[in-house]
Interface confidence: low
């Protein structure tokens, strides 16, 4: 059976980074559908990172709706029974099985648009989404391994003499912490049941000519650097500054 794959040149586009306003899509427009129709033979599952609290649109293979018999979206989320949303063109009827998340809906009426939307993506939307289009020419598939990205909250503080602690709290996936200049560091990771990870890096600098240190946090949602002046007095507190 044939299957559709996304155009390799397509890029994930995010319009804004504001909560609940940003919108991500891997969909092709009608021109791309026409241009790429002859190339869409091999089934490909796309790994797709999506920022939490954005809106995501997942697309079916670029098959003209006039050639359609049945569209089925299969949604497999962690700890949930498989949910299916189906549309049968002949009877113009939609059917849902085991679908409880009201944020996951058809973009519009499925006879007009077969795409699926997730409104305000949450951690619980991590999972596998597959569109199966049944046509007279065969079945066409497109699958997405959706990875929800959560921006960690970054803090930096000095807790002892010439020792600083940098924390990237509740990120998904885990953030990476590096220091300038390098110190004597220990890094711990705390895993949460919802899939987020808190990374804590504690560093000590013996060299007394080091007065300012920078914590750099790298994450798929973006990087952040904070710096702090090391205080020689034990127990003194100093707040971090953002670059």
């Amino acid at each position: 059976e044939g299957a559709a794959q996304p155009n390799n040149s397509l890029m994930l586009q995010t319009s804004k980074e504001n909560h609940a306003l940003a919108s991500s899509s891997l969909c092709m427009d009608e021109k791309q559908i026409t241009q790429n129709y002859s190339k869409v033979l091999a089934e490909v599952n796309t790994s797709w990172p999506v920022k939490m609290a954005t809106n995501a649109v997942l697309c079916c293979p670029p098959i003209a709706l006039r050639n359609l018999i049945i569209i089925t979206w299969e949604i497999i989320l962690r700890g949930q029974p498989s949910c299916t949303k189906a549309y049968k063109k002949e009877t113009n009827e939609t059917k849902e099985t085991n679908c409880t998340d009201e944020r996951i809906t058809w973009v519009s009426r499925p006879d007009q648009n077969s795409d699926l939307q997730i409104r305000t993506v949450a951690i619980t939307h991590d999972g596998y989404y597959r569109c199966i289009m049944v046509t007279p020419d065969g079945n066409f598939h497109r699958g997405y391994h959706l990875q929800v990205l959560v921006t960690p909250e970054v803090t930096l503080f000095q807790n002892r003499n010439r020792t600083a602690v940098c924390k990237a709290v509740a990120g998904k996936p885990a953030a990476h912490i590096s220091w300038i200049p390098e110190g004597d560091c220990a890094t711990k990771q705390e895993y949460w049941s919802n899939g987020t990870v808190t990374v804590k890096s504690t560093c000590h600098w013996e060299v007394h000519n080091v007065s300012t240190v920078t914590c750099h946090v790298s994450h798929l949602t973006g990087n952040k650097s904070l710096y702090i002046e090391l205080l020689p007095v034990p127990g003194a507190k100093k707040s971090a500054k953002l670059y």
Epitope: H19, A20, R103, I123, A170, T198
Partner: antibody, heavy 119, light 110 residues
Framework: EVQLLESGGGLVQPGGSLRLSCAAS????????MSWVRQAPGKGLEWVSA????????YYADSVKGRFTISRDNSKNTLYLQMNSLRAEDTAVYYC????????????WGQGTLVTVSS | QSVLTQPPSASGTPGQRVTISCTGS????????VTWYQQLPGTAPKLLIY???HRPSGVPDRFSGSKSGTSASLAISGLRSEDEADYYC???????????FGGGTKLTVL
């Protein structure tokens, strides 16, 4: 069926402490952020505090910062609010509420527990 | 004083359309999802509209939400006596790192 049941309210003197609990059932507790919202008699809703799914991120309204502590025990499906240094203006019905994420809506609410701070 | 501003009261007759406004700023309504809650007398609040304009299942399509810039509106068409309640708008405030409510609007069905 999603259920949130608050307990621990009552009459307390100014400066006193109370610990509210919210027992959750009917859903996977650790998949949701939780919040406390209060409503003084005859007044509007006021958000008090929120905690992320795993409990690592906590947020507080300025009016309770330093006095109230939110926590959760995912193994017991329970949300807590430790209230210290209580004032007369903390008198309210306290609701616990569930949300998909901290910054989003509360899709389910408990029925509330009344806290009265008075001498 | 509430961070989000709502009219304290609104009224209408059965069958009418009523609109309740909610005004905020770029740190809340402007850049975050707006939610509306309905609180019937003597009961806990109930989710009415989320993500600016989406209805949970079970909420009649007489209720609709909209947002433009730093303002949001709740519209109730075909007003019924059972719609008599307090209505609250709310949103996350990125500057405060907290959730903010409007002062509430008491809707009276005449």
């Amino acid at each position: 069926e999603v259920q949130l049941l608050e307990s621990g309210g009552g009459l307390v003197q100014p400066g006193g402490s109370l610990r509210l609990s919210c027992a959750a059932s009917g859903f996977t507790f650790s998949d949701y952020a939780m919040s406390w919202v209060r409503q003084a008699p005859g007044k509007g809703l006021e958000w008090v505090s929120a905690i992320s799914h795993g409990g690592s991120s906590k947020y507080y309204a300025d009016s309770v910062k330093g006095r109230f502590t939110i926590s959760r025990d995912n193994s017991k499906n329970t949300l807590y609010l430790q209230m210290n240094s209580l004032r007369a203006e903390d008198t309210a019905v306290y609701y616990c509420a569930r949300g998909p994420e901290v910054m989003l809506e509360f899709d389910y609410w408990g029925q509330g527990t009344l806290v009265t701070v008075s001498s | 004083q509430s961070v989000l501003t709502q009219p304290p009261s609104a009224s209408g007759t059965p069958g009418q359309r009523v609109t309740i406004s909610c005004t905020g700023s770029s740190s809340n309504i402007g850049n975050n999802a707006v939610t509306w809650y309905q609180q019937l007398p003597g009961t806990a609040p109930k989710l009415l509209i989320y993500s600016d304009n989406h209805r949970p299942s079970g909420v009649p399509d007489r209720f609709s939400g909209s947002k433009s810039g730093t303002s949001a509106s709740l519209a109730i068409s075909g007003l019924r006596s059972e719609d008599e309640a307090d209505y609250y708008c709310a949103a996350w405030d990125s500057s405060l790192s907290g959730y903010v409510f409007g002062g509430g609007t008491k809707l009276t069905v005449l």
